[in-house]
Structure formats: C-alpha cells, structure tokens
Interface confidence: low
Amino acid sequence: RKIPKVGHTFFQKPESCPPVPGGSMKLDIGIINENQRVSMSRNIESRSTSPWNYTVTWDPNRYPSEVVQAQCRNLGCINAQGKEDISMNSVPIQQETLVVRRKHQGCSVSFQLEKVLVTVGCTCVTPVIHHVQ
Amino acid sequence: GITIPRNPGCPNSEDKNFPRTVMVNLNIHNRNTNTNPKRSSDYYNRSTSPWNLHRNEDPERYPSVIWEAKCRHLGCINADGNVDYHMNSVPIQQEILVLRREPPHCPNSFRLEKILVSVGCTCVTPIVHHVA
C-alpha cells in the first residue's frame, strides 16, 4: 500500500504503533548516524572565490547545542589575482535543519522541535541587474 | 562538575531507560518557512559553480522532501560563460537533523536521524599536488 505523506490525516496506523498523547509525538533520541563523518574538500571556505568565515552559536537548551553559521567575507568575489571583483557577488547558501529546544517548566522538562535556517557557505553569482526606466 | 538538575529543588532522577524517548510538542516552531530552494533563490543557475537540484522524497522521514545539489561541472564558469578547468566546482555539505518514523509508518512516533546533504556548490582554487 502507498503511504500518504506527512500531514495527511488518513495515515494508516499499524497496530504496533505506540500510544501517544494528543498534541505530541514520541521521539527516540538515540540518533541514527550520530557518528558519521563529513568529508568536505579541505579548507573550501578559504579556497572559494566567495570565501566565508564560521561562527559557532551556542545554546545549552538546544540540541545540538552548537550550530555553526557561515558568513561571506566579501560583497564581491575573489578574482584570479586575489583581488575582490565587485562586478560579481558572494551570496550565502542556506539549509533548513531541525533542532530540539528544551524548556524548563518547574521540575519538568518539555521539548519543542524547531526549524532553523543555517548558512552553510557562500557561492559566487552574477548579479541581477535591475534597469531603471 | 556537579549535576545541575532542572532547578535546585527537583529530584535527581537517574532512572534512565535505554534507548530514551521524550514526548515532543507536535507543533514545529517555524514549520512554514519556505523549503523549496528553487523557489527561494536562483543562485543554483547564476553561480559560477552552478548546480542542479534533485528531489529526494521519503514518506518515512520529516521533512519528507529534501533537495540535493549536484555540481553541473568539474570546473567553474568564467566571464565568457565557458567552463574554466583551472578552478573546481565543489559541493558544500551540511549535516542536518531529520525525523525518521519508528516503527515505520507510525504517524506520531519518530527517531532523530543525522543526514548529510549537499546544499549547493562553490568555486575553489584546486589543491595542486606536485609530483617529485
């Protein structure tokens, strides 16, 4: 049988599904692929024609606690001579991820899923030129 | 370090079952932000290291649709619109957290999963290895 997409109310529920209180979901926090390695090309943030820096945002009540954000170093792009060429633009590339937020309510802890937008790096683009009439 | 409970008067309950599960509010904060990169910007076409976006769909995952970037060229596009092989287009990868239905097909039971996605491409100077 075809499984309907997330958000469809007619999602067929197998008998093995755990009972869940209304308005909440059961989340197993044993993370699948917890220890996988990111194998990005070396130092691409410095070697890129649209280089970027990383900053770490930190929140002990968020999982993961550390979220790394990239910021483009220049408005333009770096040309073959190593100079900034402002006829081109460095722009951020963004990706959504889920985080879990922990909330302290008295002696209990509650959890809320949150979508956050992470700037992953930068790319060099030809600018869009708006012609004024 | 000292164990810091939720607040000083709270019991320090160490009765932890494994694997541990938590109940999470169904309403995802910022749920309705735009998730289609084709609609959100045309950088994938205008970049000197352009990429194609491939739709990866999995109903057992939330979000069910993830867009994967694949660089179009080995080199980068120069000012003349040609591919310059003195430079390299490389993918920018990011680890993201998604929810995986567990047990499968269950509407409100999930497990966190870390996945690696290619978000876009950037143009880099190659690392040249000189042969002795």
Epitope: I29, P60, Y63, S65 | G1, I4, S13, E14, D15
Partner: antibody, heavy 126, light 107 residues
Framework: EVQLVQSGAEVKKPGESLKISCKAS????????ISWVRQAPGQGLEWMGG????????NYAQKFQGRVTITADESTTTAYMELSGLTSDDTAVYYC???????????????????WGQGTPVTVSS | DVVMTQSPDFQSVTPKEKVTITCRAS??????LHWYQQKPDQSPKLLIK???QSISGVPSRFSGSGSGTDFTLTINGLEAEDAGTYYC?????????FGQGTKLDIK
C-alpha cells in the same frame, strides 16, 4: 571521535607545584564536565575534582581543597589541573576524564566518565 | 563520603567461565553506579553506566544489575582479553568515590 590528550610526564621536588593540561577534541567541550582522577602506584582511583565549562564552577574533594585548582579554557578546549605543595604522596598517574551531559533529562553533566585521557605520570622526589 | 566496597579483591578464572563482581555502597545511591575496566598501563574504560545500562562498543557479555546499596557486574563467558582490574564508581553525591578494585586474572 572524542579524544582527551594530556601533557607529558613530570618530575617534581617536594613543595613545588604541578600544572597538567587536558586538550579535548571531537566533542562539544563547553557542555561537558571534565574531572581529574589520580592513581597512586599499585592503588585504586581517587577523584580530585571537576569543572563544567558552561557553568565555570569547579568542585573539589575535601582532601584536596585549598591545594588544587581546576580551570578550563573554552577557546582552546583545554582543561587544567594545578596541585600545589607537592609531597611524595602525590606521586601518581593523573587522568582527566569527560562527564557527558544529559540534555534530554535536563542535566548539564551526569557524572559517569565516558572518555579518559592517556594519563600523566607524576613523580615527586627530592 | 560514600564508601564503596568491592569483593573479591582478586579472582583467578578460566576462560568461558561466568564471573561476578559485587560492589556495596555505605548508603543508598539509587542507580548512580558505574563500572570501569582498567588494563595494565592503560586508562580506565567505561563498561556499564547507571547500574545496568550498556555502553556502545562494549561486548554484550558485560552486564550490570542492582540498585540502592548492592550492585553486581557479571561477565558471561570470560575471554582472555578481559584480564585487568575492575572498579565501581558512585556519582550520587560529591565527592565521587570508587571501589578499591577487583583484579581479574585469567588462568
């Protein structure tokens, strides 16, 4: 992979001070606790104290109070243990050990030691 | 301070045997009891946390049980590589305290 790398072996004279470092990599240094545990030759394990970088506070065993100082430098992800007024009884292998945090139950550190440094042998002799 | 007492101090066992090491706390420590293995000239290694919780990468022959004041570490089907000293550790109150250790020798 999480690694704790400690500074090298030390030879000290009685009355001198000792400072050992423990460099952490492969984990979120700030949210974990780092404890120091020592082991005298042929003896068992003895906890000296620990620090949770995010809280910035250290706790010490009564036996070492006033003689030990544990600090952490977040910028270099390094913890330090300083022991003053050394005597021959302080001859031991000194270990740093990581205390993981427990985000899901609301705790910053949970006190069991999941990763250990390789140990720093210290000899105190005149 | 919470005093942790292990028994036996020393045990000589043949491979494939079942080994039991006990640890007694001088007061109720709930389930905040952890077990470590230490081989000669090596750092201790976490085997079991919170009395009975297994640790990723640790062979399934190691198991733990108990709560309150009495705890047990069991090795089902001892292997030659299990030789070393085993320590229990309580973390319910500061200071952390360890048992005196149980040296396990393989015949």
């Amino acid at each position: 992979e999480v690694q704790l790398v400690q500074s090298g072996a030390e030879v000290k004279k009685p009355g001198e001070s000792l400072k050992i470092s423990c460099k952490a990599s492969g984990g979120s240094f700030r949210s974990y606790g780092i404890s120091w545990v020592r082991q005298a030759p042929g003896q068992g394990l003895e906890w000296m104290g620990g620090i949770t970088p995010i809280l910035g506070t250290a706790n010490y065993a009564q036996k070492f109070q006033g003689r030990v100082t544990i600090t952490a430098d977040e910028s270099t992800t390094t913890a330090y243990m300083e022991l003053s007024g050394l005597t021959s009884d302080d001859t031991a292998v000194y270990y740093c050990a990581r205390e993981p945090n427990d985000f899901w139950n609301g705790y910053y550190t949970t006190h069991h030691f999941d990763y250990w440094g390789q140990g720093t042998p210290v000899t105190v002799s005149s | 301070d919470v005093v942790m007492t292990q028994s036996p101090d020393f045990q000589s066992v043949t491979p494939k045997e079942k080994v039991t090491i006990t640890c007694r706390a001088s007061q109720n420590i709930g389930s905040a009891l952890h077990w470590y293995q230490q081989k000669p000239d090596q750092s201790p290694k976490l085997l079991i946390k919170y009395a009975s919780q297994s640790i990723s990468g640790v062979p399934s022959r190691f198991s733990g049980s108990g709560s309150g004041t009495d705890f047990t570490l069991t090795i089902n089907g001892l292997e030659a590589e299990d030789a070393g000293t085993y320590y229990c550790h309580q973390s319910t109150s500061l200071p952390h305290t360890f048992g005196q250790g149980t040296k396990l020798d393989i015949k």
